[in-house]
Amino acid sequence: FGISGRHSITVTTVASAGNIGEDGILSCTFEPDIKLSDIVIQWLKEGVLGLVHEFKEGKDELSEQDEMFRGRTAVFADQVIVGNASLRLKNVQLTDAGTYKCYIITSKGKGNANLEYKTGAFSMPEVNVDYNASSETLRCEAPRWFPQPTVVWASQVDQGANFSEVSNTSFELNSENVTMKVVSVLYNVTINNTYSCMIENDIAKATGDIKVTESEIKRRSHLQLLNSKA
């Protein structure tokens, strides 16, 4: 339908990151319309000839969808009426990284917003005591990272200490030949201390903590996406 002369509507996106091989979400919201049949959602990717996804008249319209997105996209159809145009992207690929545009047309007007989408691999590290080692040793493992991250050890007792001389990090390519397993070993650890293994690339930062006392071992890990407002 024609929208000439109608005003602009507000469209909001959030920069995000996708984990290769998993499903991702490209977030987009807009001023809702009272009639679903009056809402058109079009997702574009910079440099791509076809559409990433189109939703109009209450259903997907995929006749102009680009080959690289075929069978991998969906909107949350039941949430479109309340202004959610977010796109679910299945089986995220490294090549999905780039600038996306969420284009919205409603009876009120049209609007668009860009979204930077990064892709890579990131996973939680797990820190364990390596009982096989000759000295007290910690082993930090994370199954999937890409691009290659940096690994830094820290300790609560020796804050600011540089552990690079007493640690060894290796990266092992996984079977799909893109992501890598990260293994870092810290030597000469002392009891009654908390150690942190921090893994970071330009997409995510993950930390695995281990507290070793004479009576118990406590573990904690968390992961944070970088450059994302989410």
Epitope: L49, L51, N112
Partner: antibody, heavy 118, light 107 residues
């Protein structure tokens, strides 16, 4: 800085062949669809051909279908246009251009002149 | 194929004038229309895509409007550097056809 540099133009006889190249730099070449657009002397712009980032999809104007072949080598950041069975009406400046959003084109190369004449 | 028809084919205007160029598509192209500026001996330059979205770095005196089959490029106050030929292009389906161009000349 994004740059596109065409080469391979020149004088060719009717019925002859020519291969144009477009060297790209300053961006992730494999992520962008690419196009060839031509402009005959003193005339307007004519879209000739396009190719997806992966090279898996190609598109042609009816006037060149079956005679021209677009291709790309993402490892060399280069776009090609193989032109066979050339005709006098193929005489033009040939520009390569990058897909921006859908088929809007930005930037463009400086162009290379193809002259089909006996 | 989608035919694109521009009008006028040429126009004369003075610095400071408001200039309007129209482009008509032979079928509905939603808002998938781009506008380009070309100066003699130079490659075209993208001004507007998606019918009304200004390309980065393009002065705000350029604006685009329309959807469906009828589109307009407006230069609100013509500057000396705006004397050039302007082309519309439909970007919705192959072949991605151009209009025949509109030459903006100095009066």
């Amino acid at each position: 800085e994004v740059q596109l540099l065409e080469s391979g133009g020149g004088l060719v006889q009717p019925g002859g062949s020519l291969r144009l190249s477009c060297a790209a730099s300053g961006f992730t070449f494999s992520s962008y669809g690419m196009h060839w657009v031509r402009q005959a002397p003193g005339k307007g712009l004519e879209w000739v051909s396009g190719i997806s980032g992966s090279g898996g999809s190609t598109y042609y104007a009816d006037s060149v279908k079956g005679r021209f072949t677009i291709s790309r080598d993402n490892s060399k950041n280069t776009l090609y246009l193989q032109m066979n069975s050339l005709r006098a009406e193929d005489t033009a400046v040939y520009y390569c251009a990058r897909t921006q959003w859908r088929a809007s084109l930005d930037p463009w190369g400086q162009g290379t002149l193809v002259n089909v004449s006996s | 194929d989608i035919q694109m028809t521009q009008s006028p084919s040429s126009l004369s205007a003075s610095v400071g004038d408001r200039v309007t160029i129209t482009c008509r598509a032979s079928q509905d192209i939603s808002y998938w229309l781009a506008w380009y500026q070309q100066k003699p001996g130079k490659a075209p330059k993208l001004l507007i895509y998606g019918a009304s979205t200004l390309q980065s770095g393009v002065p705000s005196r350029f604006s685009g409007s329309g959807s469906g089959t009828d589109f307009t490029l407006t230069i609100s106050s013509l500057q000396p550097e705006d004397f050039a030929t302007y082309y519309c292009q439909q970007t919705t389906m192959s072949p991605y056809t151009f209009g025949q161009g509109t030459k903006v000349e100095i009066k």
